[in-house]
């Protein structure tokens, strides 16, 4: 029988390389049975995880899984770092593994990368 516990499917040591100045969606895959849990995002600061209260979030529902999304409009250099989502479910707090954003600010470099450079650096093409 399938477990009806809430599960958060962020892979251990997952990471995203992204560009400052782009929109970005950080997804927390959430599996639940009946009632959708209350999910929040936080950003790691040393040993504590600071809740992101003022940020735009949304739910995306798919057939077998839902995604709680943290939106960046746009990504900023100080968004660099590790994030975690957590769910409150029947008085239990379930925490995900952390996922790390590596933010490159091409505008602080002397020149923005060309399309050819982008093609040779596919890690930048995160979507």
């Amino acid at each position: 029988k399938e477990s009806c516990d809430v599960q958060l499917y962020i892979k251990r040591q997952s990471e995203h390389s992204i560009l400052a100045g782009d929109p970005f969606e950080l997804e927390c895959p959430v599996k639940y049975c009946a009632n959708r849990p209350h999910v929040t995002w936080c950003k790691l600061n040393g040993t504590t995880c600071v809740k992101l209260e003022d940020r735009q979030t949304s739910w995306k529902e798919e057939k077998n899984i839902s995604f709680f999304i943290l939106h960046f409009e746009p990504v900023l250099p100080n968004d660099n770092g590790s994030y975690r989502c957590s769910a409150n479910f029947q008085s239990n707090l379930i925490e995900s593994h952390s996922t790390t954003l590596y933010v490159t600010d091409v505008k602080s470099a002397s020149e923005r990368p060309s399309k050819d450079e982008m093609a040779s650096r596919p890690w930048l093409l995160y979507r």
């Epitope: 560009l19 100045g21 782009d22 940020r55 979030t57 949304s58 409009e73 746009p74 505008k107 979507r127």
Partner: antibody
Framework: EVQLVQSGGGLVHPGGSLRLSCAGS????????MHWVRQAPGKGLEWVSV???????YYADSVKGRFTISRDNAKNSLFLHMNSLRAEDMAVYYC???????????????????WGQGTTVTVSS | EIVLTQSPGTLSLSPGERATLSCRAS???????LAWYQQKPGQAPRLLIY???SRATGIPDRFSGSGSGTDFTLTISRLEPEDFAVYYC?????????FGQGTKLEIK
């Protein structure tokens, strides 16, 4: 004067292709995200696509896999390449300026604050 | 996606009256990312309000926006003849960047 001037559009058969262009002037084009929004005859506004100041692109589900947004910052130009056009794609298409990102924490997001004049795409056999 | 529902669909008022337009979201929208636009026939939309309550450049102070979470309001304190148009709300913090279906403000 800050403005967006659109070109392209016209009549195309179902399954056909079209490219829309949008030229920006009076502002630092490369520092702004850019959007396409459309409006079918007698209907409301529908967001189509956005491109950030880097490489990120996002699309409405209705056009994903058929439309491609791109930009040429050297020419202050935004493009929408539309393939496999359908009757439901028939609309006035607008380009619009989105968030500003300079560098560091130099940014703001005021929605779509400058719009092009619109260009009509007619899909008919 | 975040669905925005505007009400009423049509609002019939006279010049000089006060107009109150509502926009309700299916999920919470950060007030930083809620805008209102005005559109007249044959014209492109024009940004009126961004960040739920900030007036865009050149917009008269009779236009004001308020609200947070899932409920937002555009108020036109004293209608001028040029204010009769269609008004759209939009959330722009979450892709897809959805618009409401519009409220038509017509002369009574």
């Amino acid at each position: 004067e800050v403005q967006l001037v659109q070109s392209g559009g016209g009549l195309v058969h179902p399954g056909g292709s079209l490219r829309l262009s949008c030229a920006g002037s009076g502002f630092t084009f490369s520092s702004y995200a850019m959007h396409w929004v459309r409006q079918a005859p007698g209907k409301g506004l529908e967001w189509v696509s956005v491109i950030g100041t880097g490489v990120a692109t996002y699309y409405a589900d209705s056009v994903k896999g058929r439309f491609t947004i791109s930009r040429d910052n050297a020419k202050n130009s935004l493009f929408l390449h539309m393939n496999s056009l359908r009757a439901e794609d028939m609309a006035v298409y607008y380009c619009a300026r989105g968030f500003y990102y300079g560098s560091g924490t130099n940014y703001y997001n005021r929605g779509m604050d400058v719009w092009g004049q619109g260009t009509t795409v007619t899909v008919s056999s | 996606e975040i669905v925005l529902t505007q009400s009423p669909g049509t609002l019939s008022l006279s010049p000089g009256e006060r107009a109150t337009l509502s926009c309700r979201a299916s999920q919470s929208v950060s007030s930083s990312y809620l805008a209102w636009y005005q559109q007249k026939p044959g014209q492109a939309p024009r940004l009126l309000i961004y960040g739920a309550s900030s007036r865009a450049t050149g917009i008269p102070d009779r236009f004001s926006g308020s609200g947070s979470g899932t409920d937002f309001t555009l108020t036109i304190s004293r209608l001028e003849p040029e204010d009769f148009a269609v008004y759209y709300c939009q959330q722009y913090g979450s892709s897809p960047y959805t618009f409401g279906q519009g409220t038509k403000l017509e002369i009574k």
